[in-house]
């Protein structure tokens, strides 16, 4: 066991050395290790296949350390690896696309609060387990098309607080399973009409404190399980304009936010899904 | 540590508009995703929440309001305002800002609370 | 009329330890997290609990909150002279998207 850790067999065979003032990843862990815990160090680079040994590994935290670099084959050989976190490594900033792949059991991923300027093609490549995607907080500027397309079991996909102006069509291909999209703040101005087509199973949609001053309703009509919508703190422009999202709030059985116009002038502040549709007049 | 200053007239005429101020000091307004929030009390009662304008310049009203309330955010003042027209006697309260803070949980649960406070103003609608 | 309820008042001794019950329904307290505030006399309120539970810093540890189904509640353990005040919680509802809040208790250090 390396001397700043602790190693443990019950109720797994774990390897823990979180918040030791690590500045590398330990040689000598052992390659039984089921669980790696390395958080709260000062790590900062991840070298190719660190962790090879160990090849019964299911959960590695590597989160709230100072990483910049991981090498493409650093996780090479995990191939039971289940949880991996890689959150609050804000001088990160890009993953290689290669990184991830093999990991064909992974089922929760953290890269959240890591500086991510962008998803590089393929990054999520084979992932087909995996479940839970936090990409919050992070400066993320667009969404590549087919970006998430293997990952046909996900059921929660955070984006919140990015930087992201749209959704395009392919955005969110392949995401048959999602159940929670949360998007809110970020700058979206555009969302395609098609761009939530594959998401007959969502149930949660966040896309609050954006730049939306409409939304076509042709994007909700495919999300069939949709129950929680949030759309407020947006610059809603409440004329003839909103009428089909007027309309389609006034169907909608789910639980939906105020959606408050920001103009006209006259109707700032108040709740479109509470007016008329005489209200809704001038374009 | 932010902070928040009310200012405004403790004295308003029957049909006339109240206009308070709150400046907001050990932040910049526009920084963070926030709600700069108005709430009220009558004189021993409970509060009565009126509206919000977001860091990002979008207000939201109390509908119970109707078309009287108005909240708008001056970035270079480091202030927010709230303006009531055609106020009457029921509108004699005092007036608090505060600031809305939310929080994303691990589970995509929204977390939101009022904190901190500004010290409040009595308004009395008279003639 | 506050759309959540809470009782009127609420008294105990020093070092006692008293608690509050804050009802609402489906659309509030049932599918939001519920905050509480206290309100000393001729002051301005203060967050006391936020997220159902948590504690901003200041906040002594013996006040705490739970939530289940479309009830919350507030506990004061070890009651003391200081704690005396009018206690509110709030929560937002998802039906009339507003942040409502109860009446108010008011708790009586004997």
């Known amino acids: 066991c390396p001397g700043a850790c602790v190693c443990y067999n019950e109720p797994k065979v774990t390897t823990s050395c979180p918040q030791q003032g690590l500045q590398a990843v330990p040689v000598g862990i052992p390659a039984a290790s089921q669980r790696i815990f390395l958080h709260g160090n000062r790590i900062s680079h991840v070298p190719a296949a660190s962790f090879r040994a160990c090849r019964n590994l299911t959960i590695l935290w590597l989160h709230s350390n100072v990483l910049a670099r991981i090498d493409a084959a650093a996780f090479t050989g995990l191939a039971l690896l289940e949880q991996l976190d890689l959150s609050d490594n804000a001088q990160l900033r890009s993953v290689d696309p290669a990184t991830f792949h093999g990991l064909g059991r992974l089922h929760t991923l953290h890269l959240d609060r890591c500086g991510l300027q962008e998803l590089g093609p393929g990054l999520f490549r084979g992932l087909a387990a995996l479940q839970y995607l936090y990409l919050q907080d992070n400066a993320l500027q667009a969404l590549p098309d087919d970006t998430f397309r293997d990952l046909g079991n996900l059921t929660h996909l955070f984006l919140h607080g990015n930087r992201i102006s749209s959704v395009p069509e392919r955005a969110f291909r392949g995401l048959h399973s999602l159940d929670r999209l949360l998007l809110h703040q970020n700058r979206v101005a555009h969302v395609h009409p098609h761009a939530f087509r594959d998401l007959g199973r969502l149930m949660t949609l966040y896309l609050f404190a954006n730049n939306l001053s409409a939304l076509p309703t042709e994007a909700l009509a495919p999300l069939r399980a949709l129950q929680y919508l949030r759309l407020n703190d947006n610059p809603w422009v409440c004329d003839c304009r909103a009428r089909p999202l007027w309309a389609w709030l006034q169907k909608f059985r789910g639980s939906s936010s105020e959606v408050p116009c920001s103009l006209p002038q006259r109707l700032a502040g108040r709740d479109l899904k509470r007016l008329a549709a005489n209200d809704l007049q001038g374009c | 540590q932010v902070q928040l200053q009310q200012s405004g007239p403790g004295l308003v005429r029957p049909s006339q508009t109240l206009s308070l101020a709150c400046t907001v000091s050990?932040?910049?307004?526009?920084?963070?995703?926030?709600?700069w929030t108005w709430i009220r009390q009558h004189p021993g009662k409970g509060l009565e929440w009126i509206g919000y304008i977001s860091t990002r310049g979008s207000p939201y009203y109390n509908p119970s309001f109707m078309n009287r309330v108005a909240i708008s955010i001056d970035s270079s003042k480091n202030q927010f305002s709230l303006n009531l027209s055609s106020v009457t006697a029921a509108d004699t309260a005092v007036y608090y800002c505060?600031?809305?803070?939310?929080?994303?949980?691990?589970?995509?649960?929204?977390?939101?609370?009022?904190?901190?406070w500004g010290q409040g103003t009595l308004v009395t609608v008279s003639s | 009329q506050a759309v959540l309820t809470q009782p009127s008042s609420a008294s105990g001794t020093p070092g006692q330890r008293v608690s509050i019950s804050c009802s609402g329904s489906s659309s509030n307290i049932g599918s939001n997290t519920v905050n509480w505030y206290q309100q000393l006399p001729g002051t301005a309120p203060k967050l006391l609990i936020y997220?159902?539970?948590q504690r901003p810093s200041g906040v002594p540890d013996r006040f705490s909150g739970s939530k289940s189904g479309t009830s919350a509640s507030l506990a004061i353990s070890g009651l003391q002279s200081e704690d005396e005040a009018d206690y509110y919680c709030?929560?937002?509802?998802?039906?009339?998207?507003?942040?409502?809040f109860g009446p108010g208790t008011k708790v009586t250090v004997l």
């Open positions: 050990g932040d910049s307004i526009s920084s963070g995703d926030y709600y």
């Open positions: 709030a929560a937002w509802d998802d039906s009339l998207n507003n942040l409502v």
């Open positions: 505060t600031r809305e803070t939310q929080h994303t949980s691990i589970f995509g649960v929204i977390h939101n609370w009022l904190d901190p």
């Open positions: 997220s159902g539970n």
